[in-house]
Interface confidence: low
């Protein structure tokens, strides 16, 4: 016979059988690496029912409770549940030094509180090697060409890549996710698309990489038609 | 008061409140594109309880029930639940033509059967452009170098990339996941790592790409120290 029989009052409606779920997100890599930015750990609770909408957050850094988190107003979702977010600002050095951040969530729709913990990936940091690659000759028949930045050998996978030219940001780029390499490090590619004419005019394009294992957390490699000829 | 009260007999234990979950996986791109391979759609049921272990699968192709699926013996998981898998072999051309595959799962631990449907991504297929990129001069100071294959402009994202040299597979490569580009197509990079000596000796390395929008579903681009000089 089905487990569900005729449901009894102490059971939730089938569509919310699982109750709320909790997800804990790390800070953006760039935020942890630049002193001008504010790194944040974000705790997201989804599938909060309208009957029990109150969510309580408790935050701990290396097991010690902290009280500086900000909880945002709950947002109603299309499926008539709520999503609630709490954000903890962290110290750059604490994150880079591997401190553990715990978000504890309490809600009447849960049999007991849910705890999620996050920290920087453990292991010896490894410095990225950065190489720029010009467009293939075959691509030069097109109106736009691809400039490539290969970033390899880094650990952990937290990294930020950007492009610029003449001191101005270049925004028409896409970066692959980090890929685990056979030696346990990571690599990625970033691809900047530019008009062929800009490349042929000899403009210099630079790939900027931010990673904790780099000196000053930063390096930049340039690429142009004339460089390396 | 908590929804859970003292649980009643018609409710599952809290950790299995959701009952079984169903996941439907597409065939591997290479399997759909090569006549030598066997494309399969895979229906996976997890969190099947030991009290109600029997799972029934029904499969439908474009709404018509088919009976050639193979259900594997259930596997016990660490958390004392079962995982049950059913595999449907599909016709290459049916998948590429966009037929819909539905897996319907029945189990006493479910209030009603669960249906999951999968098909090839809809939309006009777009042919990949394939470009090979030699190692950066800066990388030539290392013992090993990176050969790069940029595959761009393709849709859908189902694709297979391999490397070979002298007719033999080269296995020391990694390929990024497809990345959604600004025009709605996808791109990726594949990186083959080879000993610098092999590159400097003038060996020819080839990047082979399989995608439905390619003539013959296949193309190959080569790369060597002498090519393009």
């Amino acid at each position: 016979e089905s487990k569900y029989g005729p449901p009894c009052p102490s059971c939730p409606a089938p569509e919310f059988l699982g109750g709320p779920s909790v997800f804990l997100f790390p800070p953006k890599p760039k935020d942890t690496l630049m002193i001008s930015r504010t790194p944040e750990v974000t705790c997201v609770v989804v599938d909060v029912s309208q009957e029990d909408p109150e969510v309580q957050f408790n935050w701990y850094v290396d097991g010690v409770e902290v009280h500086n988190a900000k909880t945002k107003p709950r947002e109603e979702q299309f499926n008539s549940t709520y999503r609630v977010v709490s954000v903890l600002t962290v110290l750059h050095q604490d994150w880079l030094n591997g401190k553990e951040y715990k978000c504890k969530v309490s809600n009447k729709g849960l049999p007991s509180s849910i705890e999620k913990t996050i920290s920087k990936a453990k292991g010896q940091p490894r410095e990225p090697q950065v190489y720029t690659l010009p467009p293939s000759q075959e691509e030069m028949t097109k109106n736009q060409v691809s400039l490539t930045c290969l970033v390899k050998g880094f650990y952990p996978s937290d990294i930020a890549v950007e492009w610029e030219s003449n001191g101005q940001p270049e925004n028409n780029y896409k970066t692959t996710p980090p890929v685990l390499d056979s030696d346990g490090s990571f690599f990625l590619y970033s691809r900047l698309t530019v008009d062929k004419s800009r490349w042929q005019e000899g403009n210099v394009f630079s790939c900027s990489v931010m990673h904790e294992a780099l000196h000053n957390h930063y390096t930049q490699k340039s690429l142009s038609l004339s460089l390396g000829k | 008061e908590s929804k859970y009260g003292p649980p009643c007999p018609s409710c599952p234990a809290p950790e299995f409140l959701g009952g079984p979950s169903v996941f439907l996986f597409p065939p591997k791109p290479k399997d759909t594109l090569m006549i030598s391979r066997t494309p399969e759609v895979t229906c996976v049921v997890v969190d099947v309880s030991q009290e109600d272990p029997e799972v029934q699968f029904n499969w439908y192709v474009d709404g018509v029930e088919v009976h050639n699926a193979k259900t594997k013996p259930r596997e016990e998981q660490f958390n004392s639940t079962y995982r049950v898998v059913s595999v449907l072999t599909v016709l290459h051309q049916d998948w590429l033509n966009g037929k819909e595959y539905k897996c319907k799962v029945s189990n006493k631990g479910l209030p009603s059967s669960i249906e999951k449907t999968i098909s090839k991504a809809k939309g006009q297929p777009r042919e990949p452009q394939v470009y090979t990129l030699p190692p950066s001069q800066e990388e030539m100071t290392k013992n090993q170098v990176s050969l790069t294959c940029l595959v761009k402009g393709f849709y859908p994202s189902d694709i297979a990339v391999e490397w070979e040299s002298n007719g033999q597979p080269e296995n020391n490569y990694k390929t990024t996941p497809p990345v959604l580009d600004s025009d709605g197509s996808f791109f990726l990079y594949s990186r083959l790592t080879v000993d610098k000596s092999r590159w400097q000796e003038g060996n020819v390395f080839s990047c082979s790409v399989m995608h439905e929008a390619l003539h013959n579903h296949y193309t190959q681009k080569s790369l060597s120290l002498s090519l393009g000089k």
């Epitope: - | 759909t32 006549i35 030598s36 007719g167 033999q168 390619l214 013959n216 579903h217």
Partner: antibody
Framework: EVQLQQSGPELVKPGTSVKMSCKAS????????LHWVKQKPGQGLEWIAY????????KYKEKFKGKGTLTSDKSSSTAYMELSSLTSEDSAVYYC???????????????WGPGTLVTVST | DIQMTQSPSSLSASLGERVSLTCRAS??????LNWLQQEPDGTIKRLIY???SLDSGVPKRFSGSRSGSDYSLTISSLESEDFVDYYC?????????FGAGTKLELK
């Protein structure tokens, strides 16, 4: 460049067996099906069977079941066909042929080997 | 098995002439038909796949077409190296079957 190199001519006695080879180069051996085709002197072509080196799966024309046995060796990128209980009817040129670059219409008999002549005679 | 009836079995023609060879399928084979060329030394080469698609490296004077169950190979202007044997091949269903062949001879 895709190449299929077949073993040399064979002169064999009736009732015996012969094993011929088809060595593939210029592509990944396990990615493509290899067909075998028979041509008797002055006659047309007849499909015998195929082997899929990826999983060693085979499919035979009904009349050749028990006559031919297909095998492959991934390490040397070579496919083999052994013919047994030979009679004069088995005297022919035997071709191996590779499928094309993918699945679909273009997949069939895209590349051909030069053939192996088998003569069955006392 | 699907029967492929190829005609003519032999054909005499002159250099520069346009010729057509035909295969008729006993059952529906869709576009699943190849045309093969066999030289006197036995070398076989695929010319046309999928009824009308030209293989790479094949001269454009070769073309393939279909009308119902009749499939044609046309050579628009014969050159000296074209006077060899031609076979059609269907692969719509197992076993693949070949036509009996056409011998193209120089008149």
């Amino acid at each position: 460049e895709v190449q299929l190199q077949q073993s040399g001519p064979e002169l064999v006695k009736p009732g015996t067996s012969v094993k011929m080879s088809c060595k593939a180069s210029g592509y990944i051996f396990t990615s493509y099906i290899l067909h075998w085709v028979k041509q008797k002197p002055g006659q047309g072509l007849e499909w015998i069977a195929y082997i899929n080196p990826y999983n060693d799966g085979t499919k035979y024309k009904e009349k050749f079941k028990g006559k031919g046995t297909l095998t492959s060796d991934k390490s040397s990128s070579t496919a083999y066909m052994e013919l047994s209980s030979l009679t004069s009817e088995d005297s022919a040129v035997y071709y191996c042929a590779r499928s094309g670059g993918g699945y679909g219409n273009y997949a069939w008999f895209a590349y051909w080997g030069p053939g192996t002549l088998v003569t069955v005679s006392t | 098995d699907i029967q492929m009836t190829q005609s003519p079995s032999s054909l005499s023609a002159s250099l520069g002439e346009r010729v057509s060879l035909t295969c008729r399928a006993s059952q529906d084979i869709g576009s699943s038909l190849n045309w093969l060329q066999q030289e006197p030394d036995g070398t076989i080469k695929r010319l046309i796949y999928a009824t009308s698609s030209l293989d790479s490296g094949v001269p454009k004077r070769f073309s393939g077409s279909r009308s119902g169950s009749d499939y044609s190979l046309t050579i628009s202007s014969l050159e000296s190296e074209d006077f060899v044997d031609y076979y059609c091949l269907q692969y719509a269903s197992y076993p693949p079957t070949f036509g009996a062949g056409t011998k193209l001879e120089l008149k």
